[in-house]
Amino acid sequence: GSQHIRAEKAMVDGSWLDLAKRSKLEAQPFAHLTINATDIPSGSHKVSLSSWYHDRGWAKISNMTFSNGKLIVNQDGFYYLYANICFRHHETSGDLATEYLQLMVYVTKTSIKIPSSHTLMKGGSTKYWSGNSEFHFYSINVGGFFKLRSGEEISIEVSNPSLLDPDQDATYFGAFKVRDID
């Protein structure tokens, strides 16, 4: 009898533990933001990309905030940040201003409390895209593990924004919390 009660209690405790774990997991912040193709800046200079989707297609956000083109951290923690940026050009869309390109992405952290900005990750390459080639494509993927505090903001800068691939599976960035700060 008492053995049976103990087993039942353990099952109940276990389910509560599962529930607690699950609710904690559900509260884990994450974001996957995809490029808003209707609002990509033109030109070849380095610009901050401010238009991203957070609630359509592959884009999702939970317990983080997207505002003014920046992904805002709501919970302190260690986060994995990632960005994938694709550049492409087809001759039917126009000419290239120059065949020598620097195709870059910068993932930047801005702190509001102590006004400062830091590049967390950068990636890219110099490329020769001949005007005689019909099609060009180049992809950059960066990812890293960072301690982030509530209120800090993550933004993306790129060179040659007019060459961005506007598909949701091509140009995106995101973050997810991996663990608390001890």
Epitope: S42, G43, S44, E91, T92, S93, G94, D95, A97, T98, S130, N132, S133, E134
Partner: antibody, heavy 118, light 111 residues
Framework: QVQLQQSGAELASPGASVKLSCKAS????????LQWVKQRPGQGLEWIGA????????KYTQKFKDKATLTADKSASTAYMQLNSLTSEDSAVYYC???????????WGQGTLVTVSA | NIVLTQSPASLSVSLGQRATISCRAS??????????MHWYQQKPGQAPKLLIY???NLESGVPSRFSGSGSRTDFTLTISAVEAEDAATYYC?????????FGGGTKLEIK
């Protein structure tokens, strides 16, 4: 549809300068090189150079480097070619032109006749 | 600079007959698997008109009697059955390399 509208005929004296214009419409002006071509009366076609109106990059045939200056006004979607130190050799029809969506010069202005005469 | 030499300089062809114009480049105009050679027709007092792009592609709206062939340095424009309206001067042009260049032209007369 793509259209290139060029300025009217010019009569100039030797040693003077002229500035020809080419107003583009029907496409995004800043995304294609705009080319200039010269044709002397009864002669063939000569490629002068081109301008990329976005950042204003230019390229010229060596022969025209000191003769022609290419500029563009993005806000007016207009390209310009200034010809300086005019001589009788510069009397010609000048065309502005743009490549097609694939290749080859598919779009041409109507041409501007420049006559250099004392 | 790439020099384009057209031949013949002038050509007289009877209505309904075939006309063939040649264009030879001083060096190859091929790159990335394509030939950067184009053909134009120009009538007196008019701007040139693109007929063939990338050596063999017929520009939209151009009659199918016009065709282009060739690669690297040797190219040909063919009019399969000449019509009266084809009387004009024909030019080849390369844009494989700056500066772009034109051939000297071939004047086609209809007999």
């Amino acid at each position: 549809q793509v259209q290139l509208q060029q300025s009217g005929a010019e009569l100039a004296s030797p040693g003077a300068s002229v500035k020809l214009s080419c107003k583009a419409s029907g496409y995004t002006f800043t995304t294609y090189w705009l080319q200039w071509v010269k044709q002397r009366p009864g002669q063939g076609l000569e490629w002068i150079g081109a301008i990329y109106p976005g950042p204003g990059n230019t390229k010229y045939t060596q022969k025209f480097k000191d003769k022609a200056t290419l500029t563009a006004d993005k806000s007016a979607s207009t390209a310009y070619m200034q010809l300086n130190s005019l001589t009788s050799e510069d009397s010609a029809v000048y065309y502005c032109a743009r490549r097609g969506s694939r290749r080859g010069i598919a779009y041409w202005g109507q041409g501007t006749l420049v006559t250099v005469s004392a | 600079n790439i020099v384009l030499t057209q031949s013949p300089a002038s050509l007289s062809v009877s209505l309904g007959q075939r006309a063939t114009i040649s264009c030879r480049a001083s060096e190859s105009v091929d790159s990335y698997g394509r030939s950067f050679m184009h053909w134009y027709q120009q009538k007196p007092g008019q701007a040139p008109k693109l007929l063939i792009y990338l050596a063999s592609n017929l520009e939209s709206g151009v009659p199918s009697r016009f065709s282009g062939s060739g690669s690297r340095t040797d190219f040909t424009l063919t009019i399969s059955a000449v019509e009266a309206e084809d009387a004009a001067t024909y030019y080849c042009q390369q844009d494989n390399e700056d500066p772009y260049t034109f051939g000297g032209g071939t004047k086609l007369e209809i007999k």
